[in-house]
């Protein structure tokens, strides 16, 4: 903590701007005022401080707003966020998208920090869910967002931001998150017609049930055999010889390449050798 | 830079256990979901058990439930695969999976051969 000592005279500063990175620490800390600092943030990223003078600018915001920074400050803290603890953030009060942009754009390109979890964790519980809006911001800079989440956290999400989900963004999603969110992406896209919702719900698929997965076999949507891998096995295993050369279409003829592979080698050995015949692929059950 | 290392593979026989770790060095911070994965030779990589970011709730495939066990000590940066009542066909290279919001991190992987 920089020592109290009062301003040399002519030094006092009356704003924000370029002579303040000559001014050592204890010259901030008795010529800056603290409220010309929150007025006039924004001016702060533009200013080559070092990170020493950064700690004192923070310490004047902190003595200034011993409750938490007003979101006015927040929004222009820029690399001042950076030397923010989480303690620091959970007595913060952020409500605009703009404000959570503004501060995820200082960490991007790196991994999630403390502070960014702490703030995400703060904005999605202000805002009551994770909305579309919110959903779309975070998997635009952290692509991985929603597959790093436990089911328990996924399960909050509300139907209505799945619009915002892109099929990469699920990339990495595990059976048990899918499980959970391919029931939220059947509600959101329920009112959709045949070919337009297979297009949108085929990423979620990884979560369906036998009983979808034979109601899409009744829409011809020739699903293709990477989206069928995916599939979760039990849900794939009841489904007849007819219903997933239904499911496929012309696709078919790939399950003889991924014979040995999981779900489509245990679906063989299920059923009986004179359906699989059918198909004319040489599959052995 | 982010390394993920696996260990305690080896040969065991049917019925037996085994305990494998895995090990991430770097500055993996804030939210991440770990996974074990396993692939036998001309197969795809297949999903084993996942301990999430949050709570350490855990996830496991229907083949392993019951019989294995995921844990993390995050302090440590380090998860675990005890692994009981094995099977000739747990058999394959388990692969450690640590993902973060913004990456995917891989192992090595080790292997693991239930014989007798």
């Known amino acids: 903590e920089v020592e109290k000592t009062a301003c040399p005279s002519g030094k006092k500063a009356p704003e924000i701007d370029e002579s303040l990175i000559f001014y050592k620490k204890w010259e901030l800390e008795a010529c800056v005022d603290a409220a010309l600092l929150a007025t006039q943030m924004d001016r702060v990223n533009a200013i080559p401080f070092t990170y020493e003078q950064l700690d004192v600018l923070k310490h004047k915001l902190d003595e200034l707003y011993p409750q938490g920074y007003p979101e006015s400050v927040i929004q222009h803290l820029g690399y001042l966020f950076l030397k923010m603890s989480p303690e620091d953030i959970r007595k913060w009060n952020v409500t605009s998208l703009e404000t959570l942009k503004a501060l995820l754009e200082v960490n991007k390109g790196h991994e999630m920090s403390p502070q960014v979890a702490t703030l995400i964790d703060r904005f999605v519980k202000g805002r009551g869910q994770l909305d579309k809006d919110t959903l779309d911001t975070l998997t635009a800079f952290y692509p991985g967002y929603l597959c790093s989440l436990s089911p328990e956290e996924l399960s909050s999400v509300p139907p209505s931001s799945i619009w915002a989900v892109r099929p990469q963004d699920l990339d990495t999603c595990d059976p048990r998150q899918l499980d959970v969110l391919y029931p939220k992406a059947r509600l959101a896209f329920q009112n959709m017609n045949g070919s337009e919702y297979f297009v949108k719900i085929q990423s979620f698929l990884g979560g369906a049930p036998t009983e979808d997965l034979k109601a899409l076999s009744q829409q011809n949507v020739s699903m293709d055999l990477a989206t069928f891998m995916k599939l979760r096995t039990d849900a794939v295993l009841p489904l007849t010889v007819a219903e997933v050369q239904k499911l496929l279409g012309p696709h078919v003829e790939g399950l003889k390449a991924e014979e040995r592979h999981r779900p489509v080698r245990d679906w063989i050995l299920r059923q009986r050798q004179d359906d699989l015949d059918t198909l004319g692929l040489g599959l052995q059950g | 830079e982010v390394q993920v290392v696996e260990s305690g593979g080896g040969l065991v026989q049917p019925g037996g256990s085994l305990r494998l770790s895995c090990g991430v060095s770097g500055s993996i911070l804030a939210l991440n979901t770990m996974r074990w994965y396993r692939q036998t030779p001309g197969n795809q990589r297949e999903w084993v058990a996942s301990?999430?970011?949050?709570?350490?709730?855990?996830g496991y495939a229907d083949s392993v439930k019951g019989r294995f066990i995921i844990s993390r000590d995050s302090a440590k940066n380090m998860m675990s695969l005890q692994m009981n009542s094995l099977k000739s066909e747990d058999t394959a290279v388990y692969y450690c999976n640590v993902q973060t919001p913004l990456n995917v991190y891989w192992g090595q992987g080790t292997q693991v051969t239930v014989s007798s």
């Open positions: 301990i999430y970011s949050s709570g350490g709730s855990t």
